[in-house]
């Protein structure tokens, strides 16, 4: 049960009391008002939202609620001057060329300022050459395709579907190969559920739609201008061929009907096999270059896109805490969409909106938290999660001394089917405590408990009667606390079966479509799942900053870290020769895990026993459970990825989106069997598991008696 | 160094099953597709499938009407070839071979004979 | 199904001499064919791809050309461990196939 005795006024006035307060009526009200007119970052439109917002929560009744902007690199289409790819022929005619917009919803057709399909940060240029299907062109598509079917995309333009990894990692992967261009398409075969109708009729990807979408490879920084530290008014600028993570060549989104017309023509090799083939009617011919008839003809990119440094604004409320207010809940997701953002951010957005309310509500009645809550608006995570990173840069030293835990809330929803969670090891009992007490909205699950529901759809694969929770990757706004800073950090929303929808994300992403109609008829008509979000979020908001002992359990980390051991163990097992040749031990790493182990156990013994009526002991205890998570930070961070400093878990290299757990050992194993130097190779592994050692040793001391 | 590595020859009675084994060794066998190839005696090679070890998804020749069936064992980096309803044309050795169209690396071929 | 035809079905040739086989494409495959040799007893070996890029450890004397359906494989100075059955593959179109072999005798 939840222990909220730290502050009320009233007894009534405690976690029940929060989430009763929550109404999805309000979240469907909040959707309504902020999906009516795009609020693309660095746009007027975007400020009024702002200020907007900033005057709501204060008349929810937070104690402060103040902008912060800073001027970043930003990147929009040239209005005139408009991008789109072409196939030529022989004479340099344009025979063919792609949709300059997507066709409007209906209801929508005279609302102005809706950006056409781009990929952000896109150098300009007008490339031309043979075309290459590189499949997903993740990094084992490229593999295939140089090692195995010897296709050199040195000089050639090369189209890859969206989905399976984040398409700023395509974009990388491309550059890599030699391409001089990528064309980013949405196959069906990913965006398009059978037995669904295309909108508006229905869920599904039209031919004509478009995901739009940074392709920046940052990882981590920030402005691409000012990694490390803030965009604020006397920041140093790096110069544009200094600026972090741009890529060096054009990139262009398509839907499939244009896709169609240019993977129709392809020549050269067949797919390698039916993993490479979407379900578009064209052989999915790998290239390079048109065939036969069509061998004359090639693709020409017309990219006249610009970098432009821009204002944006983060909303940041302050619910002052009553007993610690230098200890800091964060509640965040941003505000800033590509079009109308009916799903992304929006629906996150609501959610925040009415948790903020209900908060607001209970402090007009005299109640105040344990703990200060920050809640915030963060602009222009769409362009590489700019918002949040700014003000975690301009704001760190505080944070790293004072932030107990980040809970992100952008999407509500990717899905009706079942919850899903990403967090830390700490928030495993959280969730679970927290999902026990709510009711499921599932049909069929009618009196039973979101834990319950949540189990049965998504099982644990490790632990039979639990549900499954992710690990944390990144491509949104908790990275900076979670992979920088070390700070606790969890997220949840309501997703697809992923194992009856195996397209990728859900069809409409960043498409014009994603309007306020998608989820109110085909998604959430009632906005029970919204509802089930917004309590599943301000839930652990509400525990996080009132539970007198911090809602954290080491133990559970003791787990997973052991669990980790023996994956990346498993790993380099399969290179048993070499291991031995390069006397590769992990002893100290096992060692390390079961020291923290015991230390843990030990800890988690003290934890109940511990006099709590004492604050000083009581301060004591939550610092070393607030300062865990930071201890697994390592200062000097990940090899060429000094913003990513988490020793057990990173984004993985070779996809944004996903976490790795230790990551500094993951990628010094990877691919080794190619370097060409075996003996640094392996010595690289000898020294990365060394830093894991050491570090999870240092954590474990951390939860040791202080003296 | 790269191998692959096929079971031993086999005498099979028409109407029979033969199911053949290629193990991987050297390289990550999920990297890479694995693909059969089989010679009858003093023909042309002929590709029956293959098989992305990764994801255990086969594309088949059509030729062989869903008499093929090829699996693998990424546990045990080793993929299998299983041909059914046999007949006597269908003596010949039975190559699994790396890559994905093109074939740089083969295993030593196993001798399927079919008679009754 | 694309059919690969090779001619001439066997050949023989003296040491030193240019040899040329050919292999025709029922349908246009653009450039991709490739080329194996197969010695007595022994598995095929990978010699060029893309019609005409040699593979790793493969003597320049061997060389390919074509696209569309005609495709040349040349020795340009034959030697006696050349001699081997020679196939072409497709690799545009599933099914994969490979041409009836060119069987290469020395005189």
């Known amino acids: 049960k939840s222990s909220n005795e730290a502050t009320n006024i009233t007894p009534k006035h405690n976690m029940k009391a929060f989430l009763d307060e929550l109404k999805a009526e309000n979240i469907k009200k909040f959707l309504y008002n902020f999906t009516q007119i795009p609020h693309l970052a660095g746009t007027e439109q975007n400020f009024q939202l702002a200020k907007q917002i900033q005057s709501q929560w204060k008349e929810f009744g937070l104690d402060s609620v103040e902008l912060a902007h800073y001027d970043v690199l930003l990147s929009y289409p040239n209005k005139t001057h408009p991008n789109y790819i072409s196939i030529i022929n022989e004479d340099g005619n344009e025979i063919f060329n792609t949709s300059l917009f997507e066709p409007p919803p209906p209801g929508y057709e005279n609302v102005s300022d809706i950006v056409p399909p781009f990929s952000a940060f896109s150098p300009q240029g007008m490339p031309e050459g043979d075309l290459v299907y590189v499949n997903y062109a993740r990094t084992e598509d490229f593999f295939k395709l140089e090692r195995d079917m010897k296709i050199n995309c040195s000089g050639k333009i090369v189209i890859a579907r969206y989905g399976k990894v984040f398409r700023g990692n395509k974009v990388k992967n491309a550059q890599l190969a030699g391409a001089k261009g990528v064309i980013l398409y949405s196959d069906p075969a990913d965006y398009f559920a059978p037995g669904v109708k295309s909108y508006p009729d229905g869920w599904n990807l039209p031919g004509g739609g478009v995901q739009r979408g940074n392709i920046l490879n940052l990882n981590g920084a920030g402005d691409p201008l000012t990694p490390g530290y803030p965009a604020n008014e006397y920041a140093y600028r790096r110069g544009i061929a200094e600026a972090v993570g741009l890529p060096s060549i054009p990139v262009h989104p398509i839907g499939y009907y244009d896709a169609q017309k240019l993977l129709e023509k392809m020549g050269g090799s067949a797919p390698p096999d039916s993993s490479w083939r979407g379900s578009l009617k064209v052989p999915y011919n790998v290239g390079p270059g048109f065939t036969g008839n069509f061998s004359t003809q090639k693709v020409k990119m017309h990219i006249h896109s610009t970098n432009e440094v821009t204002r944006i604004y983060n909303v940041i409320g302050t619910l002052r805490g009553a007993v610690e207010p230098d200890r800091y809940v964060i509640l965040g997701g941003h505000r800033d969409s590509w079009v109308f953002g009916g799903i992304d951010p929006q629906s996150g957005a609501a959610v925040v909106h009415e948790i903020v309310r209900s908060f607001g509500t209970l402090k007009k009645e005299g109640w105040r938290p344990r703990r200060t809550i920050l809640f915030a608006s963060w602009d222009a995570e769409e362009f590489g999660l700019l918002g949040s990173t700014e003000w975690a840069e301009e704001n760190s030293r505080l944070l790293q001394e004072r932030g107990v835990a980040y809970i992100n809330a952008d999407s509500s929803i990717e899905g009706n089917y079942t919850l899903r969670v990403d967090c830390t090891p700490l928030m495993y009992s959280l969730v679970h405590n927290l999902t026990k007490e709510l009711k499921s909205p599932d049909e069929g699950f009618e009196g039973k408990s979101l834990y319950e529901s949540w189990t049965k759809k998504s099982p644990s694969p490790e632990f039979s009667g639990m549900p499954r929770i992710s690990k944390l990757g990144s491509g949104n706004d908790f990275e900076v606390f979670f992979q920088r800073l070390g700070i606790a950090s969890g997220r949840a929303r309501y997703t697809k079966n992923w194992e009856t929808n195996k397209f990728s994300g859900y069809p409409l992403y960043h498409s014009v479509y994603e309007t306020y109609e998608l989820v109110e008829k085909f998604y959430d008509p009632m906005f029970k799942y919204h509802l089930t979000v917004a309590q599943v979020r301000g839930g652990m908001v509400f525990e996080l900053a009132n539970s007198i002992v911090l809602p954290f359990d080491c133990r559970d980390y003791a787990v997973v870290l052991r669990k980790y051991a023996d994956k990346i163990y498993s790993i380099s097992m399969k290179h048993p020769q070499e291991m031995k040749t390069y006397s590769v031990s992990f002893d100290s790493l096992f060692s390390a895990v079961k020291n923290f182990t015991e230390i843990a156990s030990k800890f988690s013994e003290r934890l109940q026993d511990f006099d709590k009526s004492n604050p000083i002991v009581l301060r004591m205890m939550n610092d070393q459970l607030m300062f865990l998570e930071r201890a697994f930070i390592d200062p000097l961070g990940l090899p060429d990825r000094p913003f990513y400093r988490h020793v057990i878990y990173a984004p993985s290299s070779h996809n944004k989106y996903a976490g790795e757990s230790f990551p500094g050992i993951y990628d010094a194993l990877f691919d080794i069997e190619s370097k060409v130097d075996p003996s640094k190779a392996w010595g690289e592994v000898k020294r990365q598991i060394y830093v894991a050692a050491f570090t999870v040793q240092a954590a474990a001391e951390t939860l040791s008696e202080v003296a | 160094e790269f191998q692959l590595v096929q079971s031993g020859a086999e005498v099979k009675k028409p109407g029979a099953s033969v199911k053949v084994s290629c193990k991987a060794s050297g390289y990550s066998f999920t990297d890479h597709n694995m693909n059969w190839v089989r010679q009858a005696p003093g023909q042309r090679l002929e590709w029956m499938g293959l098989i992305n070890p990764n994801y255990g998804t086969a594309d088949y020749n059509q030729k062989f009407k869903g008499r093929v069936t090829i699996t693998r064992d990424t546990s045990a980096s080793t993929a299998y070839m299983e041909l059914s309803s046999l007949r006597s044309e269908d003596t010949a050795v039975y190559y699994c071979?790396?890559?994905?169209?093109?074939?740089?690396?083969w295993g030593q071929g196993t001798l399927v004979t079919v008679s009754s | 199904d694309i059919q690969m035809t090779q001619s001439p079905s066997s050949l023989s040739a003296s040491v030193g001499d240019r040899v040329t086989i050919t292999c025709k494409a029922s349908?246009?495959?653009?450039?991709?064919v490739a080329w194996y040799q197969q010695k007595p007893g022994k598995v095929p070996k990978l010699l060029i791809y893309w019609a005409s890029t040699r593979h790793t450890g493969v003597p320049s004397r061997f060389s390919g050309s074509g696209s569309g359906t005609d495709f040349t494989l040349t020795i340009s100075s034959l030697q006696p461990e050349d001699v081997a059955t020679y196939y072409c593959?497709?690799?545009?179109?599933?099914?994969?196939?490979f041409g009836q072999g060119t069987k290469l005798e020395i005189k």
């Open positions: 593959q497709q690799y545009s179109r599933y099914p994969l196939t």
């Open positions: 349908q246009g495959v653009d450039t991709a």
């Open positions: 071979a790396r890559g994905s169209s093109l074939f740089a690396y």
